[in-house]
């Protein structure tokens, strides 16, 4: 058993049918010695008397808010949560496996640049009685500071019969140098509590591996005289690290017909312009990627040919 | 990247072309190592990230773009030693910091070259003959060093008398390649920045 926060305790249980559970001793936070009784949640049934209460915690029915009273007055509370260990592996019931980029990916994180700011998000089908708290650091043995905000509900989607909820959090490394070569990964830890169930999820990454630039901005077309060709131009996104000559991007320019089946023409360039043939009803799209370290491509920025 | 790229002309700055070749070569070598050594801990998540140049060179600090010198987090350990004279330097306008930066890059390359050559000698003794260093990568390191053209003491190749532990050598190869790739990215950024300046 360990303390998650004041008056909230997590009981770790080896979770299998007929498991013996864990013996837990609760102590009433009071100078009083006599006439103390204990109850669980909203029930008025007295579970025991005395300054301490010994319970055998086996299932969720044994978890909850234990309260000690004296003469009708509440003295203190202890909330017991359960953390299930199923065959040596901590349970992951609360969050959905996003399966990207690999199985058992519960937290996904992205950064728009090298400033040390990043966003993580996760999915769940649970809509109520759910709380999250997020901590982060650079490295784990001698951790350096990363400050995270509060997790917020960022999207709701309908998937088949189920509703899916996306939560996200923004974090910022306290003293980040965009040019630094990372040798210690960022660690992100999410505590999730659903009703009386506690779970924790972690992710470990280097900022360089989670970079996904914003799409190029100011995408424009300039027709070339007496030709079907157009000059496409664009700019670096505002959110990208500067100077751009140091933090350079490479670009992919795509000409896509109205039909998805039509052949796509693609050109790769390090410049911020390209000459392409603009077909009728086609659209031109441009996306960006770090020129020197192949992390994710940005989403496409698009303009119609007409 | 396995798709055609329209690369800009290196122009007046010959080192840019060499640094791009270097990054391509080390990235290919790392990919080959990860595929060949699939049963070894060779991914970024599995290895310890060690920097053999730590406390010996200060490339990131010495080569910091002017725009980032206002960022206190980037100024932990600016070097102040002075090494002159490299053929990549674009004439007399070259600043003190630029000379320092390029000499630091040269020292990095020299250290990695020695490590890779020592390691290759060990890998050649492996009866499994599982993996060797790409000669192209070693050649590209050499070309960039020549382009930088700094005069510095030659570091003798380390020779080891004891029987090599091939498992450990292959894990060390992965660690070295990961670190060298990261340094090659920094070198490429620096050359691109200097070329634009």
């Amino acid at each position: 058993i360990w303390e998650l926060k004041k008056d909230v305790y997590v009981v770790e249980l080896d979770w299998y049918p007929d498991a013996p559970g864990e013996m837990v001793v609760l102590t009433c936070d009071t100078p009083e010695e006599d006439g103390i009784t204990w109850t669980l949640d909203q029930s008025s049934e007295v579970l025991g008397s005395g300054k301490t209460l010994t319970i055998q915690v086996k299932e969720f029915g044994d978890a909850g808010q234990y309260t000690c009273h004296k003469g009708g007055e509440v003295l203190s509370h202890s909330l017991l949560l359960l953390h299930k260990k199923e065959d040596g592996i901590w349970s992951t019931d609360i969050l959905k496996d996003q399966k990207e980029p690999k199985n058992k990916t519960f937290l996904r994180c992205e950064a728009k640049n090298y400033s040390g700011r990043f966003t993580c998000w996760w999915l769940t089908t649970i809509s109520t009685d759910l709380t999250f708290s997020v901590k982060s650091s650079r490295g784990s043995s001698d951790p350096q500071g990363v400050t995270c905000g509060a997790a917020t509900l960022s999207a709701e989607r309908v998937r088949g019969d189920n509703k899916e909820y996306e939560y996200s959090v923004e974090c910022q490394e306290d003293s980040a140098c965009p040019a630094a070569e990372e040798s210690l990964p960022i660690e992100v830890m999410v505590d999730a509590v659903h009703k009386l169930k506690y779970e924790n999820y972690t992710s470990s990454f280097f900022i360089r591996d989670i970079i996904k630039p914003d799409p190029p901005k100011n995408l424009q077309l300039k027709p070339l005289k007496n030709s079907r060709q157009v000059e496409v131009s664009w700019e670096y996104p505002d959110t990208w690290s500067t100077p751009h000559s140091y933090f350079s991007l490479t670009f992919c320019v795509q000409v896509q017909g109205k039909s998805k089946r039509e052949k796509k023409d693609r050109v790769f360039t390090d410049k911020t312009s390209a000459t392409v043939i603009c077909r009728k009803n086609a659209s031109i799209s441009v996306r960006a990627q770090d020129r020197y370290y192949s992390s994710s491509w940005s989403e496409w920025a698009s303009v119609p040919c007409s | 990247r396995n798709l055609p790229v329209a690369t800009p002309d290196p122009g007046m700055f010959p080192c840019l072309h060499h640094s791009q070749n270097l990054l391509r070569a080390v990235s290919n070598m790392l990919q080959k190592a990860r595929q060949t050594l699939e049963f070894y801990p060779c991914t970024s998540e599995e290895i310890d990230h060690e920097d053999i140049t730590k406390d010996k060179t200060s490339t990131v600090e010495a080569c910091l773009p002017l725009e980032l010198t206002k960022n206190e987090s980037c100024l932990n350990s600016r070097e102040t030693s002075f090494i002159t004279n490299g053929s990549c330097l674009a004439s007399r306008k070259t600043s003190f910091m630029m000379a320092l930066c390029l000499s630091s890059i040269y020292e990095d390359l020299k250290m990695y070259q020695v490590e890779f050559k020592t390691m290759n000698a060990k890998l050649l003794m492996d009866p499994k003959r599982q993996i060797f260093l790409d000669q192209n990568m070693l050649a590209v390191i050499d070309e960039l060093m020549q382009a930088l053209n700094f005069n510095s003491e030659t570091v003798p190749q380390k020779s080891s008398l004891e029987e090599p532990d091939f498992y450990k050598t292959k894990i060390k190869l992965c660690i070295l390649l990961h670190a060298f790739r990261i340094r090659a990215v920094t070198i490429d950024r620096v050359m691109s920045y200097l070329n634009a300046s």
Epitope: D14, P17, E59, D87, G88, I89 | -
Partner: antibody, heavy 115, light 112 residues
Framework: QVQLVQSGGGVVQPGRSLRLSCAAS????????MHWVRQAPGKGLEWVAF????????YYADSVKGRFTISRDNSKNTLYLQMKSLRAEDTAVYYC????????WGQGTMVTVSS | SYVLTQPPSVSGTPGQRVTISCSGG????????VKWYQQLPGTAPKLLIY???QRPSGVPDRFSGSKSGTSASLAITGVQAEDEADYYC????????????FGTGTKVTVLG
Amino acid sequence: QVQLVQSGGGVVQPGRSLRLSCAASGFTFSSYGMHWVRQAPGKGLEWVAFIRYDGSNKYYADSVKGRFTISRDNSKNTLYLQMKSLRAEDTAVYYCKTHGSHDNWGQGTMVTVSS
Amino acid sequence: SYVLTQPPSVSGTPGQRVTISCSGGRSNIGDNTVKWYQQLPGTAPKLLIYGNDQRPSGVPDRFSGSKSGTSASLAITGVQAEDEADYYCQSYDRGTHPALLFGTGTKVTVLG
């Protein structure tokens, strides 16, 4: 006393269907994940499928994906395995089993796929 | 489809020490705990070892398990005639959990 009692096995022709049941007692069935495991005659153990305690997630071996469906009825304390498009290679003793460091197995039920 | 490799058979005379190996990889045994089962002919498997080296109550202490790196082993110290059975190791793979990964199985024969 934890008990898993299996039923539903038998002889079936290739291409036909069969449903296996596993009735649980002696524990809070709705709190635990459950597996199906099979063993072909003279062969080793092969995992078939898993279902979470609340039925929200199901996992299958590649060899049965798209043909077998694992389900549970927590109000009846029963686990099911619906097997469709049966093949000769599905012939085996099928076991249900609880998920956890200490596990409990059903007695097994024989499924024979033969024309 | 078996990722955990066991020897097909091992044998020993009563009183001898018999060991069975179970060889896997970094993503399964290297990352997860190992169980061992005993299966007597015509019966369901019975749990002998969980958590690499833990014995459930009721399992004789002549059975012991261990794990090192990407391999595990089961030792029977002072093998007895009633130990003649098939033995299976089981673990998980980090990419496919909660799918059970079983070893190929080992037939233990007690001679004499």
